[in-house]
């Protein structure tokens, strides 16, 4: 995502002004010296090193030396303090330091910011003893050093419980600008204000950064990094990148997209999932957003039929998942359904128009006109009723439900019988004498059972008693 | 407040030279590009070039390669036009004007005129 | 180079009308600004960017446009709007101005 010019380009000249001091690398010949050990060191003699007394934290020996003479106060010898380096380079620095031989177990340990080095890091200290003294040498190399190396390295000696410091080696690793914050993709409103934002580091600092807009350099003029944009608004979609330029080179951001906000496209698909007599699943895919979240969705629905006044139905659904039931429908009807669905801009257009149709529904009306006998002789109860007056909706009488309750001494158990649709009158059994049978019925039809009709009462008598209960509802016109 | 002030108008014979500054205050000189703008006579505006404030390196429109030449003086917050060896279609009225993002021409000097003639 | 062709040249119009002056470019910019010009006086900043008004300028005046087709619009002209417009494009280098519009007041 983020290409980078070579070190060596500089397309174009921005910066004035002095420029940071040249590489250095090796800033150390160490003696090859077969006296060496990984960060483990070893007494040895060899001649002292010369090098400037160090005033800081210096440890102050109380023994003499031949019984008479102080020793000279212990420090590090001064060294090269900043060393400034291009990425992937390789660097080595030292420590030097010459410590009275009658002191035993020294080690020096590396430091960066405060913190040990320890582990696998490219440390290597060497002795040169003498008679008196050794000398110290301790060194330390990075190959290939990244920005993360950048920082403050010490060495520390501990004799005697004293600590020892050397002067801090600031090593600052140049490269290309590196970006701590890009230009992020975004949707936005028509013609609306945004900002963009780029940031980039060193070093070498400054950096300066240019934006580009579909190609085009938005400022001549680079800006101290960071840099805010500020795009007036836009009518299409357009690309933004930024250019970040130091001594070293150019890096150039990812590009991102601003997208504009429109309303979203047609729903696509619309199928219907079920049909009911009175209901209608659907689903949809949904079209595309328009860079913008779906808000709801609406489902019209249009009766079809000559004789319908041509209204619309709307429904008012949320945007996910993409499926609706449309309730309260008339039965044997057709519809046509479309889905349209809105965002922030505004309302798609409709989706394509499908067509659906609900299917029979169960009949609206009881039977009429309930009459029930007893009919002693036959042990059997007579019932008659009178064909309900049903809507086309409705569909075909296909029969009837017989619901008779028998009821007598706190018992009371229910029974339904069927009959064709061409019947008028049926005869149940008598279940249980002296109790009450409670006779209710429906029409059936493919769509469903309809209302039952209001109870009508019998008494069933111990044998011999003869009862005789009225119509359940009168017939029309029979008041 | 950001001002854009150039010198005063300018009488010269053909093939001639003559150098127009323009002084600006109120910003940071070297934060903004420095564009020069053409108007002959009841005629339009036509873009010159630019001077970078920052690098000094001047961009000439295709039609001001040559004789035009952009400079500056920025301890003096102050940017040139020279125009060598004049013609007679040099007269005009030569403006400078900030470069903003986008182009964006926000702050223009009081222009120039050059007048060619014989 | 984009050339931009300003339409009408004279725009003669009464105060509290509203007039409408187009500029359309060869191929399609990304923005275009608006400066106007009072005889004898330097181009005054007036529509950034297409359609955003510049410091001090009256909400009379909108801008419009995408592509190659740009519009400045004032919706009651005043007497004080007497002059002329430029308008000027962002997107390819050179810059370039239309030839003006002279918005004249009857």
């Known amino acids: 995502a983020i290409t980078e010019a070579r070190e060596e380009a500089k397309p174009y000249p921005l910066f004035p002004g002095p420029l940071p001091g040249s590489l250095q690398t090796d800033h150390t010949s160490l003696l090859s010296l077969p006296h060496t050990s990984g960060y483990q060191p070893a007494l040895m003699f060899s001649p002292t090193q010369p090098g400037r007394p160090y005033t800081g934290n210096v440890a102050i020996p109380r023994v003499t030396s031949a019984g008479s003479k102080l020793l000279p106060p212990l420090a590090f010898k001064h060294t090269v303090g900043h060393i400034i380096l291009s990425e992937h380079k390789d660097v080595k620095f030292n420590c030097s330091i010459s410590v009275p031989n009658i002191y035993q177990d020294t080690t020096i340990s590396w430091w960066k910011d405060g913190k040990e080095l320890l582990g696998a890091h490219h440390a290597i200290t060497q002795f040169y003893p003498d008679d008196e003294v050794t000398a110290i040498i301790a060194s330390f190399s990075i190959t290939s050093v990244q920005r993360s190396d950048n920082g403050s390295y010490i060495c520390k000696m501990k004799i005697n419980n004293e600590e020892i410091v050397s002067d801090p080696i600031y090593i600052e690793v140049q490269g290309l600008p590196h970006f701590t914050k890009q230009p992020e993709s975004m949707n936005v409103t028509r013609n609306t204000a945004f900002n963009l934002t780029c940031q980039a580091v060193g070093p070498p600092e400054p950096v300066n950064i240019f934006w580009v807009q579909n190609s085009s350099r938005v400022n001549e003029q680079p800006e101290k990094s960071p840099s805010v944009l500020t795009v007036p608004g836009l009518t299409e979609m357009a690309v933004f990148s930024c250019e970040a330029h130091n001594d070293k080179g150019l890096t150039v951001s990812k590009g991102v997209q601003i997208n504009i906000k429109a309303i979203p496209s047609p729903p696509t698909e619309v199928s219907i999932h079920n049909s009911t007599a009175h209901s209608i699943l659907i689903s949809w895919v949904p079209g595309f957003d328009g860079y913008s979240p779906f808000r709801n969705c609406s489902v019209q629905v249009k009766e079809v039929d000559p004789l319908s006044n041509g209204s619309v139905m709307i429904f008012n659904t949320s945007a996910s998942p993409h499926m609706y039931q449309i309730k309260q429908l008339q039965a044997l009807a057709n519809y046509s359904i479309g889905v349209s669905c809105m965002n922030e801009i505004g309302w798609s257009a409709v989706s394509p128009w499908i067509l659906a149709s609900t299917t029979e529904g169960a009949p609206s009306v009881a039977p009429l006109n309930v009459t029930v006998f007893l009919n002693e002789s036959r042990d059997n109860v007579d019932i008659r009723w009178m064909k309900p007056l049903t809507k086309r909706q409705a569909g075909e009488l296909v029969g009837y439900r017989i619901s008779h309750v028998w009821q007598s001494a706190g018992i009371s158990k229910e029974l339904l019988e069927e009959v064709g649709q061409n019947n008028s009158r049926a005869q149940i059994s008598v279940q249980v004498h002296n109790a009450t049978c409670t006779v209710r019925i429906a029409a059936v039809t493919k769509g469903g059972v309809g209302p039952f009709s209001d109870p009508v009462k019998i008494f069933i008598p111990a044998h011999g008693w003869v009862d005789h209960a009225p119509s359940s509802t009168p017939a029309p016109g029979n008041a | 407040q950001i001002q854009l002030v150039q010198s005063g108008p300018e009488l010269k014979k053909p093939g001639e030279t003559v150098k127009i500054s323009c002084k600006a205050s109120?910003?940071?000189?070297?934060?903004?590009?420095m564009n020069w703008v053409k108007q002959a006579p009841g005629k339009g505006l036509k873009w010159m070039g630019w001077i970078n404030t920052y690098t000094g390196e001047p961009t000439y429109a295709d039609d001001f390669k040559g004789r035009f030449a952009f400079s500056l003086e920025t301890s003096a917050s102050t940017a040139y036009l020279q125009i060598n060896n004049l013609k007679n279609e040099d007269l005009a009225t030569y403006f400078c004007a900030t470069y903003g993002h986008y182009a964006w021409f926000a702050y223009w000097g009081q222009g120039t005129l050059v007048t060619v003639s014989a | 180079q984009i050339v931009l062709s300003q339409s009408p040249a004279i725009l003669s119009a009464s105060p509290g009308e509203k007039v409408t002056m187009t500029c359309r470019a060869s191929s399609s910019v990304s923005y275009m600004h608006w400066y106007q010009q009072k005889s004898g006086s330097s181009p005054k900043p007036w529509i950034y960017a297409t359609s955003n008004l510049a410091s001090g300028v009256p909400a009379r005046f909108s801008g419009s446009g995408s592509g190659t087709s740009y519009s400045l619009t004032i919706s009651r002209v005043e007497a004080e709007d007497a002059a002329t417009y430029f308008c000027q494009q962002w997107g390819t280098k050179p810059l370039t101005f239309g030839a003006g519009t002279k918005l004249e007041l009857k």
């Open positions: 109120g910003y940071t000189f070297t934060n903004y590009g």
